[in-house]
């Protein structure tokens, strides 16, 4: 379970194409997505762009993942992973793409 | 993903039933299940839920009545004592994957 | 208890027209939206057609559409097919520690003419 989210739900993108900033994605309560962003002293950062997996701080209690479960017994299974999907609301403008690390020429690591 | 309810039969008054509903491509440590049932003519009625964690939810007239309980593949639903009011098809499943249903008849 | 009230118990249409079924519930839904629509047709298992209010399942006719939140919800059925001839259920998700986790509009009908 903690994998999941860990692996799924707070991406570092640690080579963004032009700075050396650090762009975080995390998900509230909400299943908002919140993107921030600070900026790393430079030789910070390994020269592989490694994807490093942080578990986001605003994910809820497990008592209000027992009552979204619960409570959406009618919601279809999803194609995203078990943990996403007590977490996520479907409205939620986050894909997995959106995420992805970006290496140094700016194109998405196969 | 598949869902099939097994288990109705004609069962007298008082005689304790266990419906039993096998799951295949469903991950029930990750994914809540729910019974529902429909008495003949009549609408849907929401029994209860069993969530990943085992945790298990009733609807206030069903509380006692019903017990629900899982395996890793199985989602099963006890009738502790079925009335005639019990009689039912019996559907398991949740979102967009729901079983055929099975009938139960409870008659003397 | 949550009571999930549809409105009306049964209506007829003419192919190419347009149905319009309400939901009102007694008590706000889940997060105000955890709201789905069934549809049942005569010995068979119901069929998602919409969640979270207005979701379209997979696999789901466009021509169904879901609206509303809190606790007035609409399925607008536009040019309606024979096929379309079924019941209806709103089914309301619930903060289980406060009421029932679920529960179920009383159905209703759609007549095809």
């Known amino acids: 379970f903690r994998k999941a989210f860990s692996t799924l739900l707070g991406c570092y993108r640690l080579c963004p194409a032009t700075n050396n900033a650090i762009e975080t994605v995390s998900i509230n309560n909400n299943g908002a997505a919140m993107f921030s962003s600070h900026h790393e002293p430079r030789g910070s950062i390994s020269k592989e762009c490694n994807l490093v997996y942080l578990i986001p701080h605003a994910v809820g209690s497990s008592e209000d993942l027992k009552k979204e479960e619960a409570a959406g017994i009618a919601r279809p299974l999803e194609k995203l992973s078990p943990a996403l999907s007590v977490i996520l609301d479907y409205d939620t403008d986050v894909s997995l793409e959106k995420i992805q690390p970006i290496t140094q020429n700016g194109q998405h690591p196969t | 993903q598949s869902v099939e309810e097994s288990g109705g039969r004609l069962v007298k008054p008082g005689t304790p039933l266990t419906l039993t509903c096998t799951v295949s491509g469903i991950d029930l440590s990750s994914y809540a299940m729910g019974w529902f049932r429909q008495a003949p003519g009549k609408g849907l009625g929401w029994i209860g839920t069993i969530i990943s964690s085992g945790t298990t939810y009733y609807a206030r007239w069903a509380k006692g009545r019903f017990t629900i309980s899982k395996t890793s593949t199985t989602v099963d639903l006890r009738i502790s004592s079925p009335t005639t009011e019990d009689t039912a098809t019996y559907f398991c499943?949740?979102?967009?994957?729901w079983g055929p249903g099975t009938l139960v008849t409870v008659s003397s | 208890a949550q009571v999930l009230t549809q409105t009306p118990a049964s209506v007829s249409a003419a192919v190419g027209g347009t149905v319009t079924i309400n939901c009102q519930a007694s008590q706000s839904v889940y997060k105000n939206n955890y709201l789905a629509w069934y549809q049942q047709k005569p010995g068979q298992r119901p069929k998602l057609l919409i969640y979270d209010a207005s979701k379209l399942a997979s696999g789901v006719s466009s021509r169904f559409k879901g609206s509303g939140s809190g606790t007035q919800f609409t399925l607008t059925i536009s040019d309606v097919q024979c096929d379309d001839a079924a019941t209806y259920y709103c089914l309301g998700g619930y903060d289980c520690s406060s009421a029932d986790c679920s529960a179920f509009g009383g159905g209703t009908e759609v007549v095809v003419k």
């Open positions: 499943g949740r979102g967009d994957t």
